[in-house]
């Protein structure tokens, strides 16, 4: 089965620059299929833009200005790239790549879409670091005692742009856990969002991870915020100086215990 | 040019109560095209639901039913037993791949229909209220209440800022909410909730602990030093990133 990944959750550009949006195809040979690009402007219908066929033929939608979009594919990396030249306000949109995927029976085809990349155009000069800054909240004793469950809360602040994806996993598991989240909120020139995960008592002794995807994450990798297991000693982390881990970094906390 | 027009911009549905989405075609006969349905959820993920000839995306066949009404020029999608997972924007789209019509392998989309999911009408349930703290940050967690109307107050004399609460459907089909705020004196902040003409306090849920229980976090101190990136510690602890915590037993 074909699968499409668009590694850039968003792409922020200033006017007249060039944006390059990537789409990685897996489960199917890119040189044996056509890749399609669609855009969804705010408040408008999703519209076909351009496609590149298995033999490299490019087809543009009528009415799309020539020279605006360029599409290509790199078989070695199984990637299709949509290049948007001379970006302007009207290019603000979410861009999706797509392909026709044959189902089990030949002839039964469906079109699958990538997760989309939002093109953001800004004229602001932002601080150097506009990646999400995490704060963790551990379950209250009252909740764990009374409800035999605990809620972890992951607060992310001072990020730009507003496009962010948060999910939760147990350590050493790739299963995405069912979580809940608030709306993304504007705070001055940046944004904040929080997500929370309620787990049963039996899972409180496991380490949990709040995984954050954002355009400005360090090194362009998902940020992993570690929530330590809750056993007999509950800890809280510092809000201002959280240390989240990128890639395979491991978070190390040094705790000082003061007995009464 | 053809146009796919959803019957409604927004459709509120109740958990477990069947709902029908309709999409009409303007400027053409819908029978000349194959109809597809997609769902876009939070985070822009576009998921394939249905394509004619009984083709369903993974996990959709049991709870969704697609159809086309040629006489009325309508595409129809039924959600047989909606759950909170079904919230999102639903799009009808058409193509003529494999049809006796003008061949096109691009999809033509209609505007989305926003489906909002509400819990099924049920007996009123009083919330549980818990406070979570970290430094100046305080979160008030309000769990398992019905109906939705609620007022959450974080009680403090030294407010820095407060945010609008997030109210969502809980997995059990009631509501959960979280309200966040920043306070100079976070240790003294409590949460009170007005729901169903009653007031519920976080202090109602506090438990007395003895030394065999959880260590109750009291305060967090931070050794402020020049900020550096997180390294990969092996045997070394980079002191500039050590969180100093005072845990009172």
């Amino acid at each position: 089965a074909g699968h499409l990944e668009q590694p850039q959750i968003s792409s922020t550009k200033t006017l007249s620059k060039t944006a390059r949006l990537e789409c990685v195809v897996s489960g199917i040979t890119i040189s044996a299929t056509s890749v399609y690009w669609y855009r969804e402007r705010p408040g408008e219908v999703i519209q076909f833009l351009v496609s590149i066929s298995y033999d490299g033929t490019v087809r543009k939608e009528s009415g799309i200005p020539s020279g605006k979009f360029e599409v290509d594919r790199i078989p070695e990396t199984s990637t299709s790239t949509l290049t948007i030249h001379n970006v302007e306000k009207q290019d603000i949109a979410t861009y999706y790549c797509a392909l026709w995927e044959a189902q089990q029976e030949l002839g039964k085809k469906i079109k699958v879409f990538g997760p989309g990349t939002k093109l953001i155009i800004t004229d602001k000069q932002l601080d150097a670091d506009v990646s999400p800054k995490p704060t963790i909240f551990l379950p209250s004793i009252a909740e764990t005692k009374l409800q035999k469950a605990g809620t972890y809360l992951c607060l992310l602040e001072k990020f730009f742009p507003d496009v962010i994806k948060i999910h939760w996993q147990e350590k050493k598991s790739n299963t995405i856990l069912g979580s809940q989240e608030g709306n993304t909120m504007k705070t001055n020139d940046t944004y904040m969002k929080f997500s929370w995960l309620t787990v049963p008592e039996k899972s409180l002794d496991k380490e949990h991870r709040c995984i954050v995807r954002h355009e400005n994450n360090k090194n362009g990798v998902d940020q992993e915020i570690i929530f330590p297991p809750i056993k007999t000693d509950v800890i809280t982390m510092d809000p201002k100086d959280n240390c989240s881990k990128d890639a395979n970094d491991t978070l190390l906390l040094q705790l000082t215990n003061t007995s009464a | 040019a053809i146009e796919l027009v959803p019957e409604h911009q927004t459709v509120p549905v109740s958990i477990g109560v069947p709902a029908t989405l309709r999409c009409s075609m303007k400027g053409e006969a819908i029978g000349n095209y194959y109809i597809n349905w997609y769902r876009k959820t939070q985070g822009n993920t576009m998921t394939f639901i249905y394509r004619e000839k009984d083709i369903y995306g993974p996990g959709f066949k049991d709870n969704f039913q697609g159809d086309i009404d040629i006489a009325k020029n309508l595409a129809v999608l039924k959600i047989l037993a909606p759950s909170e997972r079904d919230e999102g924007s639903y799009y009808c789209a058409c193509d003529t791949l494999g049809m006796g019509g003008e061949y096109t392998d691009k999809l033509i989309f209609g505007k989305g229909t926003r489906v909002t999911v509400e819990p099924r009408s049920q007996p009123h349930t009083k919330p549980s209220v818990f406070v979570m703290k970290n430094g100046t940050n305080v979160a008030c967690l309000v769990k398992e209440f019905y109906p939705k109307d609620i007022r959450i107050n974080l009680v403090s004399s030294k407010k820095i800022t407060e945010f609008d609460p997030a109210i969502v459907i809980s997995p059990s089909g009631k509501y959960n909410a979280v309200k966040l705020g920043k306070y100079e004196d976070s240790n003294s902040v409590t949460c009170s909730v007005q729901h169903d003409n009653k007031t519920v306090h976080s202090t109602d849920f506090e438990v007395k602990t003895d030394s065999t229980d959880h260590v109750k976090p009291k305060e967090t101190e931070n050794t402020k030093q020049p900020s550096k990136s997180c390294h990969k510690p092996k045997a070394i602890v980079h002191t500039e990133k050590v969180n100093m915590m005072s845990l009172t037993v």
């Epitope: - | 053409e28 000349n32 000839k53 040629i70 494999g98 049809m99 006796g100 003008e102 061949y103």
Partner: antibody, heavy 115, light 106 residues
Framework: QVQLQESGPGLVKPSETLSLTCTVS????????WSWIRQPAGKGLEWIGR???????IYNPSLKSRVTMSVDTSKNQFSLKLSSVTAADTAVYYC?????????WGQGTLVTVSS | SSELTQPPSVSVSPGQTASITCSGD??????ACWYQQKPGQSPVLVIY???KRPSGIPERFSGSNSGNTATLTISGTQAMDEADYYC?????????FGGGTKLTVL
Amino acid sequence: QVQLQESGPGLVKPSETLSLTCTVSYGSFSSFYWSWIRQPAGKGLEWIGRIYTSGGTIYNPSLKSRVTMSVDTSKNQFSLKLSSVTAADTAVYYCARWLRAFDYWGQGTLVTVSS
Amino acid sequence: SSELTQPPSVSVSPGQTASITCSGDKLGDKYACWYQQKPGQSPVLVIYQDSKRPSGIPERFSGSNSGNTATLTISGTQAMDEADYYCQAWDSSTVVFGGGTKLTVL
């Protein structure tokens, strides 16, 4: 209720061109595909081709080299021309509306190819 | 283009169920239709999109289509159902008819 009516000569000489017209009344003409189907005596149905109101056509591959279809939206009519006819083209010719199926048919006109 | 194969004839007693099959390569991936034609008359659509009945067609007519076979079922067959029945399907460019089945009501 949509009605279709075929018209044209009932007798055509071999090697000549068969010409038929179908007039559509009491219904929408645009946005539909219109087809010609034929049936030799005592035999099955054979699809000849179809035309869209914009003029786009698709023909049966076995007849493609001899078939031409056209449309006149101002008169709600579409036409069939079949060139170089032989006795094997003798049949009842039906016009029909195509919407995922042939849902409306004319009553058919018999065309005999004979010298 | 693909071919559709039907049995030349099917017989049924009044009140019984008649089944007429139509087979073709991966027919289940396409939509199948069925037409009834009585002597001297134009064909009439009885089933479209595998299993849908146009208005005016009695409920005793039903259709199914999966794998390589589409089936027209007439339950409680009546004398007036005696006719030729044609299946039809399309692919991306052409329309194909089956050879026809003569239904005899004994």
